[in-house]
């Protein structure tokens, strides 16, 4: 029998210092975790430890804090670098800076290889991307050899901004004849390291004929055996055991999000490469896990650049961004049409000709806009305001939703109007009115939303049966200030960008700004 | 500066085994593997295996599988490579190379010439 | 094991010619290939890796393209210090395997 070990994670998203428990700024810290230096600390003492011993990680590095903003990539093949992965897979975010914003930062700069079997370049990209990522790539793993196969979610068009010249195939289609290559190469141990989430990880398992283990990422799913160690919940075993279509236990595994675990799977094959046992857990990288000094004082030495950009400015407004609870929880306020704006814009991809645009709808609870921007400072909005704004570094992310469920969720929006409570939702894409006269939970009497499939945007009443995507906090989309029914019903489900980060593009972008309070939320008295 | 700094040309009658050396400086030994290669006279080049100095696994080619061992001092940043049961045909020089990260052969020793005659 | 096949094996050209070497592999390598100069009497050189990614401090006339199973080495204008032998390698998968390589002479 021989044992190897795979450290993993997943969606780190430029969380490249420590965070604190919820993977937010570190404010304390002798309670703070993860940050790529105790990562090291951790790798380092158990590639020591151990003989054989792989560290993967399944996508989604970029996009997340202003690391990425300031450094578009360049911190994520510098450190990652550094602590000598083995191998990446593609995320989505990988491609928010487009094609280009991945080739020169990470994939000419890494030292390990990026991968994915189900991207494929076509037309004048095929030859510049050529050889920079691979389907597969086989390692030496002690006396053995390893196949690591890579996938990405196929949905990343939608998603982020990988232009026309690649193709995402279905992950299981694209990986079954890389597999099935590699295996006439005698290559009889087999990872398949991706990023499309738990649902297609387990799917992979159970239908790639080949398949040893699968590592995985996207969902940002928690398993854990025994009594997890911080907040997050488990979603199932780890790892996870799928019985594959022709009989074999396959182990799943993912690290949940953000750096804040290592994931540590062992597994034992037979000389002919069968899996005879898995076992492991994520490792919680708390404080008791010192940060290495190297790689520390590296960061020390990258972050200067930080500090100068967070004053830097990034555009002008030339009205009054009102973010003050006064407004935003009571009313439409510019500065939540202002953030609503910016979701959109960022989510602009023109996909289908039948479409104009995949999503044209956007909430956005009233209680996450904590500050307002006076314009009377010369117009100058910078990235320091605006974290005064958005404070949380939480993320816009886009979700399925039927038109049942958001008229529950404005119901709630207005279940308790008048107490200063943060559920009010403003919009984009989207006219309400309330009749405040009415019972809670039958105040929304005229719920409007912005055509998809047209050519010339309008608004419609919204169809209870019919299925709308929209853009949200992730915070509403995990159920906060009390929007269950978003957490229940939800269809579907893709982690997006930072929000400060998706504010701050849309006004370099537009350089003037000039929101204004224009009727998206309205208030009647009586029939209507 | 990378250097990858072989011992000296052997003569070995047939039968007889032969160890090289390759002593390694101007990087961290165990972040890179150390592949070997022969070059036969006027032939062209032939990967013989490869070794992990970090934790000693080694890969072989199966041609050489039984009479190659490939072994490394991580104290004094050197890999060897033993050849047994030596037939003229083994008459080579024989090289170390140090991979980068993508397993591509960075660097070069110098070649030990290895003839083996009776 | 994957067979890699030079071609010419060798050829004559001047300097300041455009001298093009192809390799096949009797698979697809994955863009897994490298190309190596040997001069007579020393250890090989490498030139390039991942197929086209030129190692610091090779003269940019130096270049490499294809995917899947076809290989090609380009100097753009040959200089003095080139002519040599190169091979191309295969390292996608064990066992590695080089080309029986070419041969640059001058003409």
């Known amino acids: 029998a021989w044992e190897l070990t795979i450290l993993h994670t997943n969606d780190v998203h430029s969380r490249l210092e420590q965070t604190s428990e919820d993977s937010s700024k570190c404010v304390n810290a002798s309670r703070c975790m993860g940050g790529v230096a105790r990562l090291f600390t951790k790798v380092q003492q158990i590639r020591r430890a151990e003989p054989n011993v792989l560290l993967l990680d399944a996508g989604d590095q970029y996009q997340g804090t202003i690391w990425f903003t300031v450094y578009k990539g360049a911190e994520v093949a510098h450190f990652m670098n550094a602590l000598r992965y083995d191998a990446m897979a593609l995320g989505n975010h990988e491609f928010d800076n487009g094609v280009e914003g991945l080739i020169e930062p990470l994939l000419k700069e890494a030292k390990f290889p990026i991968l994915s079997a189900n991207i494929k370049a076509k037309g004048p990209l095929a030859s510049q991307i050529s050889g920079l990522y691979l389907p597969y790539k086989v390692l030496p793993v002690g006396d053995e050899v390893v196949g690591i196969v890579g996938y990405t979610s196929k949905e990343t068009p939608f998603l982020s901004n990988p232009g026309t010249n690649l193709v995402f195939e279905d992950e299981i289609t694209a990986l079954q004849p890389e597999v099935d290559k590699l295996k006439t190469l005698n290559v009889n141990k087999i990872i398949a390291l991706g990023h499309s989430g738990f649902e297609m990880d387990k799917l992979i398992a159970q239908k790639v004929r080949g398949v040893d283990v699968v590592v995985g990422g996207h969902s940002n799913t928690f398993l854990y055996t025994g009594n997890p160690p911080s907040k997050e919940v488990p979603a199932g075993k780890y790892p996870f055991i799928v019985t594959s279509d022709d009989g074999r236990k396959v182990p799943v595994v993912q690290a949940y999000a953000f750096g804040k675990y290592l994931g540590y799977l062992k597994i034992e094959f037979d000389e002919r490469g069968n899996v005879i046992s898995s076992h492991g857990n994520p490792i919680l990288l708390n404080s008791s896990i010192p940060e290495d000094p190297s790689i520390k004082a590296d960061i020390n030495k990258w972050r200067i650049k930080l500090d100068n950009y967070s004053t830097q400015e990034l555009g002008k407004t030339i009205v009054y961004l009102d973010g003050s609870s006064q407004s935003c929880r009571f009313r439409e306020c510019n500065m939540g049409n202002l953030i609503c704006d910016a979701m959109i814009n960022n989510n602009l991809r023109h996909t289908d000709e039948m479409f104009w645009n995949h999503v044209s709808m956007c909430i956005l609870n009233g209680g996450g806009i904590r500050s307002p921007i006076d314009e009377r400072n010369n117009g100058t909005i910078t990235w320091e305001n605006l974290a005064a704004v958005l404070p949380f570094g939480g993320t816009f992310d886009l979700v399925q939703l039927k038109g049942s469920t958001l008229k529950k969720a404005f119901e709630h929006s207005v279940h308790r109007y008048g107490q200063s409570t943060g559920e009010f939702l403003q919009v984009g894409g989207i006219h309400v009115v309330y009749d405040l006269s009415r019972k809670p939970g039958d105040r929304v009497v005229k719920l409007d939303v912005l055509c998809t499939k047209c050519r010339v945007p309008s608004y419609d009443p919204l169809k209870m049966d019919e299925v709308y995507k929209v853009i949200l906090p992730n915070f509403l989309a995990n159920g906060g200030d009390g929007f269950q029914m978003i957490k229940d019903e939800l269809l579907r489900h893709d982690s997006g960008d930072q929000d400060i980060n998706v504010v701050s593009t849309y006004i370099s972008k537009m350089k003037v700004i000039y929101p204004a309070v224009e009727g998206r939320i309205k208030f009647s008295t009586g029939s209507h | 500066e990378v250097q990858l700094v072989e011992s000296g040309a052997e003569v070995k009658k047939p039968g007889a085994s032969v160890k090289v050396s390759c002593k390694a400086s101007g990087y961290t030994f165990t972040d890179s593997n150390m592949d070997w290669v022969r070059q036969a006279p006027g032939q062209g080049l032939e990967w013989m295996g490869d070794i992990n100095p970090n934790n000693g696994g080694t890969i072989y080619n199966q041609k050489f599988k039984g009479r190659v061992t490939m072994t490394r001092d991580t104290s004094i940043n050197t890999a060897y490579m033993e050849l047994s049961r030596l037939r003229s045909d083994d008459t080579a020089v024989y090289y170390c190379?140090?991979?980068?990260?993508?397993?591509?052969?960075?660097?070069w020793g110098q070649g030990t010439t290895v003839t083996v005659s009776s | 094991d994957i067979v890699m096949t030079q071609s010419p094996s060798s050829l004559s050209a001047s300097v300041g010619d455009r001298v093009t070497i192809t390799c096949k592999a009797s698979?697809?390598?994955?863009?897994?290939l490298s190309w190596y100069q040997q001069k007579p009497g020393k250890a090989p050189k490498l030139l390039i890796y991942?197929?086209?990614r030129l190692i610091d401090g090779v003269p940019s006339r130096f270049s490499g393209s294809g995917s899947g199973t076809d290989f090609t080495l380009t100097i753009s204008s040959l200089q003095p210090e080139d002519f040599a032998t190169y091979y191309c390698?295969?390292?996608?998968?064990?066992?590695?395997?080089f080309g029986q390589g070419t041969k640059v002479e001058i003409k």
């Open positions: 190379a140090m991979t980068n990260w993508d397993y591509a052969m960075d660097y």
């Open positions: 991942r197929a086209n």
């Open positions: 698979q697809d390598i994955n863009s897994q």
């Open positions: 390698q295969q390292y996608d998968v064990f066992p590695r395997t």
